[in-house]
Interface confidence: medium
């Protein structure tokens, strides 16, 4: 993994890279390799494509071995028929201010998300759309079904968050978490990403996890029963250890994978969960990475191009677990 060893290249001749993929010198200055693309795993030896403005994002300092190729400028977003650059903010309507971040859009409300509790002077608070106003406003209904609308009242405002207590209420934050994107690889280890603002200051952040839809070496078509065209979730005979750039998972996992079809359909994860997996590297270092585990798969005709992470952001979404935040309290 590191550059301390002597240069040893896999082949004498330079590799042949797919169209659009740069041939670059590895990070150790040893061998010419095909540059890793957006969303792919990268190491010191396997650099990201510099001609596309990609860099290897190692995340926390504990994971300095393996990173994910991330766009410096970020992937653009398509939203409401318009294209927005990563980092660009726009108003999707009078109610929402949105930001594009690495191909995903997150929005925060411009209208107050406050709560009004019943009180003696306003026993029946109700939000109504007033003519000429974008945001709904609080009004006080009279009891006994009388619908005379009083003046709009100032509403109870959630307290702002100023410190590390994760249980503090957040002011004016519509918590949004996108579904996990489809795995960047149709077989073998890939990356799945999502964007969330479920954090202390309602800021958009990108999260990533490892994923494996199916092993590349498995010949799954053999297992399709006669008269059937698909095998949705093939049985895995024995527990497996995951490999990640020369590092191996500490535990074995009886993981579910998605099958294949012979009629042009593709099978992709439908319900997933995210669990931490520890990998042990040859030098003894232990890395912890979040990884997708498949609960159910679905077979469908909505099949984007293989390993196209951009398309996967737009077409195939996974229904999975929401973010789990652990805190020291």
């Amino acid at each position: 993994q590191d550059c301390s060893a002597q240069c040893q290249c896999a082949a004498e001749a330079a590799p042949h890279c797919p169209a659009g993929v740069s041939l670059v010198l590895d990070g150790c200055g040893c061998c010419r390799v095909c540059a890793k693309q957006l969303g792919e795993l990268c190491t010191e030896r396997d650099p990201c494509d510099p001609h596309k403005g990609l860099f290897c994002d190692f995340g926390s300092p504990a994971n300095r071995k393996i990173g994910v190729c991330t766009a410096k400028d970020g992937a653009p977003c398509v939203f409401g028929g318009s294209v927005y650059r990563s980092g660009e903010s726009f108003q999707s309507s009078c109610k929402y201010q949105c930001t594009c971040l690495d191909g995903a859009v997150g929005c925060v409300p411009l209208c107050s998300m406050d709560v009004r509790l019943p009180s003696p002077d306003c026993p029946f608070p109700r939000r109504v759309k007033l003519p000429g106003k974008c945001c709904e406003e609080w009004v006080c209904d009279e009891p006994k079904d009388r619908t005379a609308v009083g003046p709009a009242l100032a509403a109870y405002r959630l307290e702002d968050t100023f410190g590390p207590d994760p249980t503090m209420m957040r002011a004016n934050c519509l918590v949004q978490t996108t579904e996990w994107s489809a795995c960047s690889k149709t077989c073998g280890m890939g990356i799945s990403t999502r964007v969330t603002n479920d954090n202390t200051f309602c800021r958009l952040e990108k999260q990533s996890r490892l994923c494996m839809v199916r092993p590349c070496e498995a010949d799954l078509e053999e297992n399709i029963k006669k008269g059937k065209k698909c095998i949705r979730t093939p049985k895995i005979a024995k527990p497996v250890k995951f490999e990640l750039s020369g590092c191996t998972s500490v535990k074995t996992y009886r993981a579910k994978f998605c099958g294949v079809c012979t009629d042009g359909r593709c099978c992709t994860p439908h319900r997933t969960t995210t669990l931490p997996v520890e990998f042990k590297c040859p030098d003894g270092e232990i890395m912890k990475k979040n990884m997708m585990f498949i609960k159910t798969c679905a077979c469908h005709y909505n099949c984007p191009g293989d390993n196209d992470i951009f398309e996967s952001l737009y077409y195939r979404k996974m229904y999975g677990d929401m973010a789990h935040h652990h805190h020291h309290h």
Partner: antibody
């Protein structure tokens, strides 16, 4: 109006236990945490600990073995207990609301002397 | 032991701008340190000005702003007034505890 008020003994003997109460109004202890901070005479501030709105606590490691913070939400009171008091613990003790330490009590001066 | 360092004293002319800083001994200050700024007036009363790096506490005028400048937390006071003459303390959060800086005594000249 948000207010916090510390109460407790003014004089404590060495090795004794100090118990201070912070009574709050204008907000609920289920909505905000409360910090305890002290200021020795002529010196700066020292953070002692916090009880969060959900009841969890964090303490300054230097005082961990001597310090307990608890609360009675229904009474709007936070109780601060420090054991084995020493003359170096002489200071003005404050409670402050979590959320940027935005509101503070007026402080209570505690002298540790025999 | 983590030490949080502030300028011991600072002076500013009325109407001027001053930036007080807060340095951590164990590396750059980030938003995860939730930098807080507290004012202690000559009458010994305390009030919070800024929490969570840049969020003003209720009732604090917008002359006060918080940010991260380089590797330090910063409190900027624009249009300084005579009653801004006070001691200013920063507090940084380190995963399980806060640490206060030694404080800066701000003098408004004139």
């Amino acid at each position: 109006e948000v207010t916090l008020k510390e109460s407790g003994p003014v004089l404590v003997k060495p090795t004794e236990t100090l118990t201070l109460t912070c009574t709050v109004s204008g907000f609920s202890l289920s909505t905000f945490g409360v910090h305890w901070i002290r200021q020795p005479p002529g010196k700066g501030l020292e953070w002692l600990g916090v009880i969060w709105r959900r009841g969890g606590t964090d303490y300054n490691a230097a005082f961990m073995s001597r310090l307990t913070i608890s609360k009675d939400t229904s009474k709007s009171q936070v109780v601060f207990t420090m054991t084995n008091m020493d003359p170096v613990d002489t200071a003005t003790y404050y409670c402050a609301r979590d959320g940027g330490f935005d509101y503070w009590g007026q402080g209570t001066t505690v002298t540790v002397s025999s | 032991e983590t030490v949080v360092t502030q300028e011991p004293s600072f002076s500013v002319s009325p109407g001027g701008t001053v930036t007080l800083t807060c340095r951590s001994s164990i590396g750059a200050v980030t938003t995860s340190n939730y930098a807080n700024w507290v004012q202690q007036t000559p009458g010994q009363a305390f009030r919070g000005l800024i929490g969570g790096t840049s969020n003003r506490a209720p009732g604090v005028p917008d002359r006060f702003s918080g940010s991260i400048l380089g590797n330090k937390a910063a409190l900027t006071i624009t249009g300084a007034q005579a009653d801004d003459e006070s001691d200013y303390y920063c507090a940084l959060w380190y995963s399980t505890h806060y640490v206060f800086g030694g404080g800066t005594k701000l003098t408004v000249l004139g």
